[in-house]
Interface confidence: low
C-alpha cells in the first residue's frame, strides 16, 4: 500500500502480512497486507486491528477490527464507546456510510481515525497529537512502526521511477519497472492517467499513486482509494500547506 | 538520530507551560514534571552518549530538583495528559454530559495544537 | 558573578601540541557543558567541541577528530582544551563557553579568548 | 565554507531596521529549535543575543527580535543605535552538529 508517515514522507510498500502501524502508551495499530494479483510484488490492506489500551477512568481496553467486506460499526465486544468507565463517551464509532465509512474518535487522547472500505481493500487515516505519538515507554525497543519509521528500504517501491518511465508509452508496459505481472492490456496508460485525472486533478504524489495502482491491477476502485485518501488528509492533516505533496519525498526508514 | 532528548524536553516544557520559575504553590507539579523529564531521559541514555543537548538536559534537571527542593522519589506526572491539544472542532467536545478529566484535558489552552498525521491505501 | 577566565596567549611551533584552560566561577560547574570556539583572524566562529564536566562526555567537531581532546577538574571547576599536531592554519583565538542547562542550547558565557599563534 | 549562509554585510541608519538571514538545511534550521545569535565586537569574545529562536537573555534590549520561517532563521534589530554596529553570528544545533553561520557585518551608516 501507499503510505504517509507522521512526517510526511510518501512511500509505496510491498510489505506483506502483520505490521505495526502505530504503537505507543495508548493506541496500537496493526495491518495485514496481501499482494493484489497471484505473484504481485505490490500489497493492499486486507485486515486493520485498532487497540485501544485501558486508560485511567476514561475508557476500557477496547479492539476495532475490520476486515475486507466486513467494516464494523463497533468494537469487537459489540460496544460503540469506551465501556462503562466515567468517560467512556471519549470514546466513540461513528458509522459514516454503512459497510464502507467508519469514524472513530478517541477524544481523551485527542486522536481521530478514519477507516474506509474502498473495493476490496480497506484504508487507513488518522490524526494524532505528538505527544500520544511519542508517548513511548522506551525508544530503544521501537521496532518497525511504519507511520513513524516508513518502510524498511528494502520492502519499498520506487513508483515515481515507475511512473516517470510509463509516461507516454501508452499500452506498452515496461515489465522490468512493474512490480506487479501485467495488468490486463485494455488498461493503457492514457486511460489511467484519465480516470485518475477525473477525481484527482492536481498531479500530486496521491495522483500518481492513483496512476501507478491502475496500471498495476485495472481496477478502478484504486481511483477511489488515492481519491478518499486525499480527503482524508484535508479533514485530518493540520497543516493544509501540506496536504498535496509532490516532490521525492522518499527516504531511509527511522529518520 | 536515535536519541530522543529533544522529545524528553518539548515533553518537559510543555508540562510545565514553559515556566521557567514556577510559583511556589506550582512545586508539586513543577517536581513531579522534574520526575517525569529525568525518566524520559533515563530512557534514551543509551542512545544520547555525546549528545550535548542530553547532557544540558541531565544537568539542567539536577540543577533545578535542587533548587525546588525536589525529592527523587515521588509521583510523575500524567505522560502529556494535562497538556494535549484539543481535539479539534467544537462538536466532539459537546457530546459527552461528564465534565471527567477524560474530557478536561482537550478544553482548549493551546493555541498550536502539534497534530500530526499518517494514512495508508491503495496497493 | 558568572566568569569565564582562559590562561594567557600561546605561541607554538608547528607539530607541537596547546593546552588552553578556562576557570568557571560564580555557578555550579557540572551543571552546565563548556564549548570550545575558535576563530582565525578576520574569520567567523567556528565550533570545535563540547565536554559535559558532569559525566565527561565529549562531542567533538568531526574535522577535529583525532586532535583535540577536551577534558575537566571538578575539584577546580577548569575546563580545557588541548590541540595537537598543531598547524599555521590553527593559529586562533580560542574561546570557552558555558552551555545553557536544561533543554536549551546556547552558549550563555563566554570567556574572554586565549589567542594561539601557531609559527615556525 | 558554513553550511549556514549569512549575508556579508548589512546597513542602516540610526533608528532604521536591519533583517540578518541565516539559511540551512531543514535538519539544521528547519527541524532545530535550537538556533541563538551572537553579537561580536572587534577584540572582544562574543555575546548571546538570542536563543531558541525568539528569546532574549535579560539584558539584551528588545530592539532584537529573532523569528524563524522554513529552513531560515533571522535576527531583526529594530531603531538601530550606533553600539549595535559589530559582526553577528547565527548558531544552530540539530543532533550532534553544531553550526555557526558566516557572519554578517552590520553597519550604522
Known amino acids: 500500500p501507499h503510505l504517509r508517515t507522521f512526517t510526511d514522507r510518501f512511500q509505496t510498500c510491498k510489505v506483506q502480512g502483520a505490521w505495526p502501524l502505530i504503537d505507543n502508551n495508548y493506541l496500537n495499530v496493526q495491518v495485514t497486507n496481501t499482494p493484489v494479483l497471484p505473484g504481485s510484488a505490490a500489497t493492499a490492506t486486507s485486515k486493520l486491528t485498532i487497540i485501544f489500551k485501558n486508560f485511567q477512568e476514561c475508557v476500557d481496553q477496547k479492539v476495532y477490527q475490520a476486515e475486507m467486506d466486513e467494516l464494523p460499526a463497533a468494537f469487537v465486544d459489540g460496544s460503540k464507546n469506551g465501556g462503562d468507565k466515567h468517560g467512556a463517551n471519549s470514546l466513540k464509532i461513528t458509522e459514516k456510510v454503512s459497510g464502507q465509512h467508519v469514524e472513530i474518535r478517541a477524544k481523551y487522547i485527542g486522536t481521530t481515525i478514519v477507516v474506509r472500505q474502498v473495493g476490496r481493500y480497506l484504508t487507513f487515516a488518522v490524526r494524532v497529537p505528538e505527544e500520544v505519538v511519542n508517548a513511548v515507554e522506551d525508544w530503544d525497543s521501537q521496532g518497525l512502526y511504519l507511520c513513524l519509521r516508513g518502510c524498511p528500504l528494502n520492502q519499498q517501491i520506487d513508483f515515481q521511477a515507475f511512473h516517470t518511465n510509463t509516461e507516454g508509452t501508452g499500452a506498452r508496459r515496461l515489465a522490468a519497472a512493474s512490480p506487479a505481472p501485467t495488468a490486463p492490456e485494455t488498461f493503457p496508460y492514457e486511460t489511467a492517467v484519465a480516470k485518475c485525472k477525473e477525481k484527482l486533478p492536481v498531479e500530486d504524489l496521491y495522483y500518481q499513486a492513483c496512476v501507478f495502482d491502475l496500471l498495476t491491477t485495472g481496477d478502478v476502485n484504486f481511483t477511489l482509494a488515492a481519491y478518499y485518501a486525499l480527503e482524508d488528509v484535508k479533514m485530518l492533516h493540520s497543516n493544509k500547506d501540506k496536504l498535496h505533496l509532490y516532490e521525492r519525498t522518499r527516504d531511509l526508514p527511522g529518520r | 538520530s536515535p536519541c530522543k532528548i529533544l522529545k524528553c524536553n518539548s515533553e518537559f516544557w510543555s508540562a510545565t507551560s514553559g515556566s521557567h520559575a514556577p510559583a511556589s504553590d506550582d512545586t508539586p507539579e513543577f517536581c513531579a514534571a522534574l520526575r517525569s523529564y529525568a525518566l524520559c531521559t533515563r530512557r534514551t541514555a543509551r542512545t544520547c552518549r555525546g549528545d550535548l543537548a542530553y547532557h544540558s538536559a541531565v544537568h539542567g534537571i539536577e540543577d533545578l530538583m535542587s533548587q525546588h527542593n525536589c525529592s527523587k522519589d515521588g509521583p510523575t506526572s500524567q505522560p502529556r495528559l494535562h497538556t494535549l491539544p484539543p481535539a479539534g472542532d467544537s462538536q466532539e467536545r459537546s457530546d459527552s454530559p461528564e465534565i471527567c478529566h477524560c474530557e478536561k484535558s482537550f478544553h482548549k489552552h493551546s493555541a498550536t495544537p502539534n497534530y500530526t498525521h499518517c494514512g495508508l491505501f491503495g496497493d | 558573578e558568572v566568569q569565564l577566565v582562559q590562561s594567557g596567549a600561546e605561541v607554538k611551533k608547528p607539530g607541537a601540541s596547546v593546552k588552553v584552560s578556562c576557570k568557571a566561577s560564580?555557578?555550579?560547574?557540572?551543571?552546565?557543558?563548556i564549548s570550545w570556539v575558535r576563530q582565525a583572524p578576520g574569520q567567523g566562529l567556528d565550533w570545535m567541541g563540547w565536554?559535559?564536566?558532569?559525566?565527561?562526555?565529549?562531542n567533538y567537531a568531526q574535522k577535529l577528530q583525532g586532535r583535540v581532546t577536551m577534558t575537566t577538574d571538578t575539584s577546580t571547576s577548569t575546563a580545557y582544551m588541548e590541540l595537537s599536531s598543531l598547524r599555521s592554519e590553527d593559529t586562533a583565538v580560542y574561546y570557552c563557553?558555558?552551555?545553557?542547562?536544561?533543554?536549551?542550547?546556547?552558549?550563555?558565557?563566554w570567556g574572554q579568548g586565549t589567542l594561539v599563534t601557531v609559527s615556525s | 565554507q558554513s553550511a549556514l549562509t549569512q549575508p556579508r554585510s548589512v546597513s542602516g541608519s540610526p533608528g532604521q531596521s536591519v533583517t540578518i538571514s541565516c539559511t540551512g538545511t531543514?535538519?539544521?534550521?528547519?527541524?532545530?529549535?535550537?538556533v541563538s545569535w551572537y553579537q561580536q565586537h572587534p577584540g572582544k569574545a562574543p555575546k548571546l543575543m538570542l536563543y531558541?529562536?525568539?528569546k532574549r537573555p535579560s539584558g539584551v534590549p528588545d530592539r532584537f527580535s529573532g523569528s524563524k520561517s522554513g529552513n531560515t532563521a533571522s535576527l531583526t534589530i529594530s531603531g538601530l543605535q550606533a553600539e549595535d554596529e559589530a559582526d553577528y553570528y547565527c548558531?544552530?544545533?540539530?543532533?550532534?552538529?553544531?553550526?555557526f553561520g558566516g557572519g554578517t557585518k552590520v553597519t550604522v551608516l
Open positions: 563557553a558555558r552551555v545553557g542547562s536544561g533543554p536549551y542550547y546556547y552558549m550563555d558565557v
Open positions: 560564580g555557578y555550579t560547574f557540572t551543571s552546565h557543558g
Open positions: 565536554i559535559s564536566p558532569y559525566s565527561g562526555n565529549t
Open positions: 531543514s535538519s539544521s534550521v528547519g527541524d532545530s529549535i535550537y
Open positions: 531558541d529562536v525568539t
Open positions: 548558531l544552530s544545533y540539530a543532533g550532534t552538529d553544531t553550526l
